[in-house]
């Protein structure tokens, strides 16, 4: 088996505090998924990350950091159009049981006002495995830069699995990608949240197989309406 890069897949530790909106969804003490803080009460993640109860880690790039905030959450709202068969509309809002305390290390993500075009450089982050198929989970938040790929080019790889609210990102001939455990985490482009990690080819990091993300710019109305409805 070809050796993989030793971060996210082929990434590096994020600059400390550079992703203050990044959260981890834990099941007990174990990483389940990534997510992003939308405001003091709400986290946005992938619908396929649904559990009955969550522990949300905020405010530190290091899992297990005692200075981090840990907040329980027991209510979550999947997009009503989410399908376990087609993976379309793979997003979900998680309502925190108590408010997050905003600080230099805990900030709200900027939701997009527009969809960024193919070719845009973006950063994906998470605590997901840094090796594949065998797993190695880091304690520090990892980042990798990828570029948005046009739906036409991505369809050449994934054919009819690709739906129009999915977004692809990667680097040609590179292993740079997200992997298991990064699900629900952010793809940030020019300071706004453009994607949530959804799926990709396994083992991770196969050159020319882009990562697939939920295209957040298509769902801002649903996000805002859902938070308002369940205030």
């Amino acid at each position: 088996e070809e050796a993989q890069g030793d971060k996210i897949i082929d990434g590096a530790p994020c600059a400390r505090g550079s992703h203050p909106w990044q959260v981890a969804l834990l099941s007990g003490n174990q990483l389940h998924c990534g997510g992003v803080l939308v405001n003091e009460r709400w986290v946005l993640t992938a619908a396929h990350c649904k559990m009955n109860e969550y522990t949300v880690h905020l405010g530190s790039d290091t899992l297990g950091d005692r200075r981090a905030q840990r907040i329980k959450a027991s209510k979550s709202f999947r997009h009503p159009g989410y399908s376990t068969q087609t993976h379309v509309n793979d997003l979900m809002l998680v309502k925190l049981n108590s408010q997050a305390r905003l600080s230099s290390m805990v900030k709200k993500v900027r939701l997009p006002s527009r969809c960024e075009p193919p070719g845009t450089t973006c950063t994906v982050s998470g605590w997901g495995t840094t090796t594949s198929p065998d797993v190695t989970f880091p304690s520090d938040l990892m980042c990798v830069d990828v570029k948005l790929i046009s739906p036409q080019d991505c369809t050449k790889v994934y054919k009819d699995l690709l739906e129009n609210s999915m977004l692809c990102a990667g680097i040609p001939d590179s292993k740079k990608n997200a992997c298991n455990g990064d699900s629900g985490g952010p793809l940030v482009c020019r300071g706004t949240l453009q994607g949530l990690v959804s799926w990709g080819t396994f083992p991770c990091g196969q050159p020319n197989d882009p990562g697939v993300y939920t295209q957040v710019c298509k769902f801002t109305k649903w996000i805002n309406d859902t938070m308002k409805k369940h205030r």
């Epitope: 396929h48 993976h87 990690v197 396994f202």
Partner: antibody, heavy 128, light 108 residues
Framework: QLQLQESGPGLVKPSETLSLTCTVS??????????WVWIRQPPGKGLEWIGS???????YYNPSLKSRVTISVDTSKNQFSLKLSSVTAADTAVYYC????????????????????WGKGTTVTVSS | DIQMTQSPSTLSASVGDRVTITCRAS??????LAWYQQKPGKAPKLLIY???SLESGVPSRFSGSGSGTEFTLTISSLQPDDFATYYC??????????FGGGTKVEIK
């Protein structure tokens, strides 16, 4: 290396519930995005997929058996289990557990998988 | 459900023969096909996945080909250890996974 071992009663009475457990050793059942799978083979016949589970607890069942099947996972014991209710003689088979290797991870990890590691199988006879 | 039809159901051959087994899907499954070998009283063993990828540790005399609806498993030079039953499995639809009826390769 990874090994799977089925266990459970070899004889079940008609109308009762068949219960089997698969113990995974040499690796963690929590290693997403693998699928943990049950397959059966009636005497002298071919293979039939029963269903599968992810470590998160998401389950996928054969529609022909869905109303009678429950698959569950216990990550703390590194085990997953099969329950098949209201059994008849037609459920007499060798039952195998296996690991399913997916083509995709994340939202698509329950989808498009083949089995690379199998248990030895356990024979279950349904008879009064 | 996608039906998988294997042919022949039984095949008589000698050591050293080139053996070909065919599997047809009732609808296109792209390259999502696996081949397994099963010996009496034993669990199936993975030989080929994604139609043509050889599983680690499987002898190179085994090869797979095909895409869409028609697939073949070829054993280039049959060895004594290869007398067994072979199954194809489609994993190209979300549910259920389905297997072919099996091909028994027996000594001529």
């Amino acid at each position: 290396q990874l090994q799977l071992q089925e266990s459970g009663p070899g004889l079940v009475k008609p109308s009762e519930t068949l219960s089997l457990t698969c113990t995974v050793s040499g690796g963690s059942i929590s290693s997403s995005p693998y699928n943990w799978v049950w397959i059966r083979q009636p005497p002298g016949k071919g293979l039939e997929w029963i269903g599968s589970i992810l470590h998160s607890g998401s389950t996928y069942y054969n529609p022909s058996l869905k109303s009678r099947v429950t698959i569950s996972v216990d990550t703390s014991k590194n085990q997953f289990s099969l329950k098949l209710s209201s059994v008849t003689a037609a459920d007499t088979a060798v039952y195998y557990c296996a690991r399913g290797v997916p083509t995709y991870w994340g939202a698509a990890s329950h989808y498009y998988y083949y089995m690379d590691v199998w248990g030895k199988g356990t024979t279950v006879t349904v008879s009064s | 459900d996608i039906q998988m039809t294997q042919s022949p159901s039984t095949l008589s051959a000698s050591v050293g023969d080139r053996v070909t087994i065919t599997c047809r899907a009732s609808q296109s499954i792209s390259s999502w096909l696996a081949w397994y070998q099963q010996k009496p009283g034993k669990a199936p063993k993975l030989l080929i996945y994604k139609a043509s990828s050889l599983e680690s540790g499987v002898p190179s005399r085994f090869s797979g080909s095909g895409s869409g609806t028609e697939f073949t498993l070829t054993i280039s030079s049959l060895q004594p250890d290869d007398f067994a039953t072979y199954y194809c499995e489609q994993y190209g639809s979300e549910s259920p996974l389905t297997f072919g009826g099996g091909t028994k390769v027996e000594i001529k």
